[in-house]
Amino acid sequence: LIQERRSHEVNPAAHLTGANSSLTGSGGPLLWETQLGLAFLRGLSYHDGALVVTKAGYYYIYSKVQLGGVGCPLGLASTITHGLYKRTPRYPEELELLVSQQSPCGRATSSSRVWWDSSFLGGVVHLEAGEEVVVRVLDERLVRLRDGTRSYFGAFMV
Amino acid sequence: LIQERRSHEVNPAAHLTGANSSLTGSGGPLLWETQLGLAFLRGLSYHDGALVVTKAGYYYIYSKVQLGGVGCPLGLASTITHGLYKRTPRYPEELELLVSQQSPCGRATSSSRVWWDSSFLGGVVHLEAGEEVVVRVLDERLVRLRDGTRSYFGAFMV
Amino acid sequence: LIQERRSHEVNPAAHLTGANSSLTGSGGPLLWETQLGLAFLRGLSYHDGALVVTKAGYYYIYSKVQLGGVGCPLGLASTITHGLYKRTPRYPEELELLVSQQSPCGRATSSSRVWWDSSFLGGVVHLEAGEEVVVRVLDERLVRLRDGTRSYFGAFMV
């Protein structure tokens, strides 16, 4: 797994931003803006919510999601799970990479209280060419999108 | 915007730390220590709270602020906003880069309860030479400084 | 302190993951998995909970811990402290590098309520060869381990 940063190569990096279309409600991963505003791809590609690796190596991957609500939606579990997951041809199921669990609704002491919370994840993982990384949030009903600055997803080779 | 990391060049990086003078109360961005203790600048400069880019490229920028209080200050909005913002001559207004909203006071179930919370932001953005990045916290009355380890601001080229 | 990233060298990086043995209850730092699953060491070494630097330079160091509980353990202080600390032969005591304080129990409005919270730290520090970085959590009784994805510790040279 030895991997070097060669001086003549552009270092892979990406930053994808939240958009109106990010929340599908289908149970799939979050979708992301890849070109407009602050979003970019450099030496990585994108497919249906996934950052796709084109060059094997160690990557610092990160995601932030902005959560918010008024009280807690009926039937919402007390736990929100925000995670980064890997898809690889080597294995049939998604693999958890970095995960956080939070109980943000618990901050609201009354059912009509507005609350906000944020979840940040970041860490170094090894990724092979062709492997994909996606972001999932359960329950995504509490993700608050606005302008791409509050919920995002990115990576760079280290 | 293609940018390479050349082997003979020092990679720009900085870590600035919170100090007693960080909170101005003037409505401006937070100010930072640049030399003492853990703080340093390498290939980036500093001016009035801003990290100033000297070499164009993609940078991972980050900030953490330590929040705390006893109950909630009278008249304090239920939302605390912590953000990283860009200033560029290309546009007349500051541009939001990475932002978090939190409702930390909501954790305190009584008005006399001590509470602590922390907000972390990090992400990759493209910055041109001469552009500035600043940190803002609204309401900064809840930022708790101590020794430079709890609130900080940094960047490095990726 | 000028340090360059040379193209023919492997860039030091590591990601260590939480394991059943991470929480010692002895008051020492958290211990980590270094080889299995997502964990790896590349150009850094490990000793009794510490990442040990073999090559001097600036490193982005990070840690996340997953916190959780049912109400608040009797006698638990209202503050949880999660920090990254440096050990150096130059100084007899550990030095705080990056620290967060949180009051996660305050989210639970009743003593029987389940709550979850997460604390993330990351920042750039200068480390000399032979220096060590450890993670501490006070009170570690609230750290929730599972599979290495929720609590972790890592670093890479920038």
């Epitope: - | 409505g27 401006g28 001469g130 | -």
Partner: antibody, heavy 119, light 109 residues
Amino acid sequence: EVQLVESGGGLVKPGGSLRLSCAASGFTLSNAWMSWVRQAPGKGLEWVGRIKSKIDGGTTDYAAPVKGRFTISRDDSKNTLFLQMNSLKTEDTAVYYCTTAMAGAFGFWGQGTLVTVSS
Amino acid sequence: EIVLTQSPGTLSLSPGERATLSCRASQSVSSSYLAWYQQKPGQAPRLLIYGASSRATGIPDRFSGSGSGTDFTLTISRLEPEDFAVYYCQQYGSSPMYTFGQGTKLEIK
């Protein structure tokens, strides 16, 4: 599109006063750092003063030759910047430009308005 | 007070040639806060370069800036007829807060 349009210039006697206006469009003036820059006939550019954005406190700074005589202000409701010039001197004769002043450079300029101080 | 001195005062060149304009500071200035402007007769100045080397929006890539410390350069790689104008350098950060050079006139030979 960002646009700045100055007005209010004209002929004034030494010791007199004049108020210049700069109407901004395409952005919110209160969110911007703004400056006035002047240029005497056939001469180079000279910075006059600046006002910071509202979020940065809206504080003002002035060049030494005009300090105490000139005042920069803003009317946020009209998205307009002002330069109040008192105790005018013949050496204040110039074209006055309204400019944005983010990150140490003047990114956007108005077309300028001529102020002539003469008896 | 930092003084910016531009040279030459006048530069006579033909279209297609390369122009090199110099700006020297009386003491070291931050390269992050060194800008260049172009001004044509009867018009307002236009920002060309900021941060010593970053091109402003819409500026053709034949314009480039370089330098650090006390010596800065604006280069126009291949002169077009519309490039003949007066060029000013400007610094920010030292008292007075913003300072301009006296200008270099680029004229057609």
